[in-house]
Each structure stands twice: as C-alpha cells, then as structure tokens.
C-alpha cells in the first residue's frame, strides 16, 4: 500500500538538521532515503467514514477513488498531528462497512501515548467533516509492539 511520510526537515535538540525517516514508511517526495532508526512508537488506528460507501475501487490503489481518499486521509493526519514528533503513516487499508479505514501511525518514541493519539484525532473530527467532507465515527487506537520499536526509557525532551 502506498504510504505517507511526514517529510519535513527538523532540528534535533542538539541542533543538527535531519529529515525524519522511519521504516517501513516511504515517500516519493522525500529528499533522503529512509534509514533504520530506533526510538519509534507505532499505533494502529481504525475508524469509520459513515458518509462514504465502500466499493471495489477501494481495493485497487490505481483508481481515482482510492487515491483521492488516501490523499485526503494522509493530509488530514498531517494536519491533526502536525510535525513535532509525528513521523508519518503507513499501511492504509480500506474495508467494507460504509468505509472502514485502518492504518499505522509512527511517532518519535516517548512523545505521545495511545490516549492522546485518540484524543487529538477525536478533537479534529468536526474539522475533518467540513474540510474533507468525511464523517468520522467509531475511532479505535491501540499500541503496536513493533520489534524494532525500542522500549520506553528516559524521556525525550519536549
């Protein structure tokens, strides 16, 4: 599945400039190749878009319907989490049931927890409805215990 990377340039707290890049995320507009990096938290998120209907086009990434919906969802998540520690999203899947969206979000480890991922998404639902014409419901967020996501240790400065 095509993926979206938060491809902004950031500065670390030591002031060295780098591009956030986290496997398994890739991005065609990203100026450096993603490299393996530790200290990443992943969250699995699913939600319903109740004002859309699922059809076979959403099983084919080459269709306009698939690509437009994926673009809107990717843009929406970049708006919700902005850039501070948000590294991107991947593995967008569409399922029947109006439209059920499933995806994985990646964040710099230690910068957010599962409750705040869900809170911030829920806070944005009204804006999503007006900006993207997406009526969102049944939001569910859970931790993803990726083997290469390091254990949470001393906190990341905020």
């Amino acid at each position: 599945t095509p993926t979206t990377l938060a491809s902004h340039s950031t500065k670390t707290d030591a002031s060295s400039t780098h591009h956030s890049s986290v496997p398994p995320l890739t991005s065609s507009n990203h100026s450096t190749s993603p490299q393996l990096s530790t200290g990443v938290s992943f969250f699995f998120l699913s939600f319903h878009i109740s004002n859309l209907q699922f059809n076979s086009s959403l099983e084919d990434p080459s269709t306009d319907y698939y690509q437009e919906l994926q673009r809107d969802i990717s843009e929406m998540f970049l708006q919700i989490y902005k850039q501070g520690g948000f590294l991107g999203l991947s593995n967008i899947k569409f399922r029947p049931g109006s439209v059920v969206v499933q995806l994985t979000l990646a964040f710099r480890e230690g910068t957010i927890n599962v409750h705040d991922v869900e809170t911030q998404f829920n806070q944005y639902k009204t804006e999503a409805a007006s900006r993207y014409n997406l009526t969102i419901s049944d939001v569910s967020v859970s931790d993803v215990p990726f083997p290469f996501s390091a254990q949470s240790g001393a906190g990341v400065p905020g």
Epitope: K11, D13, Q83, G84, G85, I112, H115, D116, P157, G158
Partner: antibody, heavy 119, light 107 residues
Framework: QVQLVQSGAEVKKPGSSVKISCKTS????????MNWVKQRPGQGLEWIGQ????????NYNGKFKGRATLTADKSSSTAYMELSSLRSEATAVYFC????????????WGQGTLVTVSS | EILLTQSPDFQSVTPKEKVTFTCRAS??????IHWYQQKPNQSPKLLIK???ESISGVPSRFSGSGSGTDFTLTINSLESEDIATYYC?????????FGQGTKLEIK
C-alpha cells in the same frame, strides 16, 4: 540547546493592550506548538492557548478567546501573545512553553514575563 | 473542561522523608497526566510525563503512577532542593488544565 527567551516586564493601564514575545533557538521553530500559560501572583497555572508556527494554526482556551491573540514570526523564530482590554485580573506572569502536539506536555519553558495592570 | 484536584494544598516535610502527592481528575484521562516542579520565581520544570515516564536529567527519586482518575507523584527521599510547588497537568482534552498545586514546606 533549546532556549525560549521572553521579553521584559510590562506595566500597563486598564483597557490598554500588551504584546509579549518569546524568542526561540536550538530547534526548528516551525515544527512545534508554542503554548502560553498564565500564573497570577501566588496562584496556579492556567493554559491560554497555542500556535503552530508552521501554518499559524491556533487553539485557545475559551476563557481567553477574544482577549489573547497568538502570532508567530518564522523569520525570527519568535512567538507573540497580545493581550487586549487589560483588566487588573490580567496582572500575572505569562510563560511560553513548547510542546510536540496540540495536546501534550511542556519540557521547555520561557523564563516568564510579568505584566502588571494598574491605573 | 477536566478539573484536576491536588491534595493536600500544603505539606510540611522533613529531609529524607518519602513524600506523596495526589492528583484526581474529574473524568477518566487514561495516563495523560504530567507532573511539574516550580520553585519561587522560576519556570515550571517537567518531572514525569504520561503518569509514570521518567524525564532525562530528573533525579530517580521522583516517580509517578496511576491511571484513569487517580494519580500519584512520589519523592522517594526528599532533598532540601525539592522544596517547591508541584503541579499536575492533563493532555487528554481541551482546554489543557493544571491542578491547583501542592506546596511543600520544611517542618
């Protein structure tokens, strides 16, 4: 290292306005939310609102909407808060504080700016 | 708005004592609570994030626990430099809110 340096103390008349600044360094200013927090003398902390300098997106505590205006200048990596129609209750120390997201915690704080409203 | 109530408002303590602060939320907030220390005429300093996650540079005598509505900050063996006011803050809902604080005083 990350630094947030605020402008100096202000004394203002009731009904006037004040604009305080928070100059940042040591990180990518555009990519983090800047929050403002009020502390009245001898009192607790109160969140005023936040701005995302990358696109100017703002969120306010309803209690301060219309009285506080948050702006940011990316070219100078400086955040601003303007308080209007000042009343005596606005006498307080105001802090800027950086966060990763809209809803988050604050690891970096400015040193505070004391605003005194007095006739 | 989520109300955070800290107790007690004031606490008299002695060095080396184990000190516990509590913060109660008006509704369940998971683990979205953060603790700060503020000394007179200084900015708040982050001690613990997300109820129990340690912060680089903060002494290990500070620890946190809790979830849902009840949270605790513990200083394992109080040092004289820990005399300050302690605040909890929630990030589970807007507006972001703080507790009213607990002020430590030397007995």
């Amino acid at each position: 290292q990350v630094q947030l340096v605020q402008s100096g103390a202000e004394v203002k008349k009731p009904g006037s306005s004040v604009k305080i600044s928070c100059k940042t360094s040591g990180y990518a200013f555009s990519n983090f939310w800047m929050n403002w927090v009020k502390q009245r003398p001898g009192q607790g902390l109160e969140w005023i609102g936040q701005i995302y300098p990358g696109d100017g997106d703002t969120n306010y505590n309803g209690k301060f909407k219309g009285r506080a205006t948050l702006t940011a200048d990316k070219s100078s990596s400086t955040a601003y808060m303007e308080l209007s129609s000042l009343r005596s209750e606005a006498t307080a120390v105001y802090f800027c504080a950086r966060s990763y997201y809209r809803s988050a915690w604050f690891a970096y704080w400015g040193q505070g700016t004391l605003v005194t409203v007095s006739s | 708005e989520i109300l955070l109530t800290q107790s007690p408002d004031f606490q008299s303590v002695t060095p080396k004592e184990k000190v516990t602060f509590t913060c109660r939320a008006s509704q369940s907030i998971g683990t979205s609570i953060h603790w700060y220390q503020q000394k007179p005429n200084q900015s708040p300093k982050l001690l613990i994030k997300y109820a129990s996650e340690s912060i680089s540079g903060v002494p290990s005598r500070f620890s946190g626990s809790g979830s849902g509505t009840d949270f605790t900050l513990t200083i394992n063996s109080l040092e004289s430099e820990d005399i300050a006011t302690y605040y909890c803050q929630q990030s589970n809902n807007w507006p972001l809110t703080f507790g009213q604080g607990t002020k430590l005083e030397i007995k």
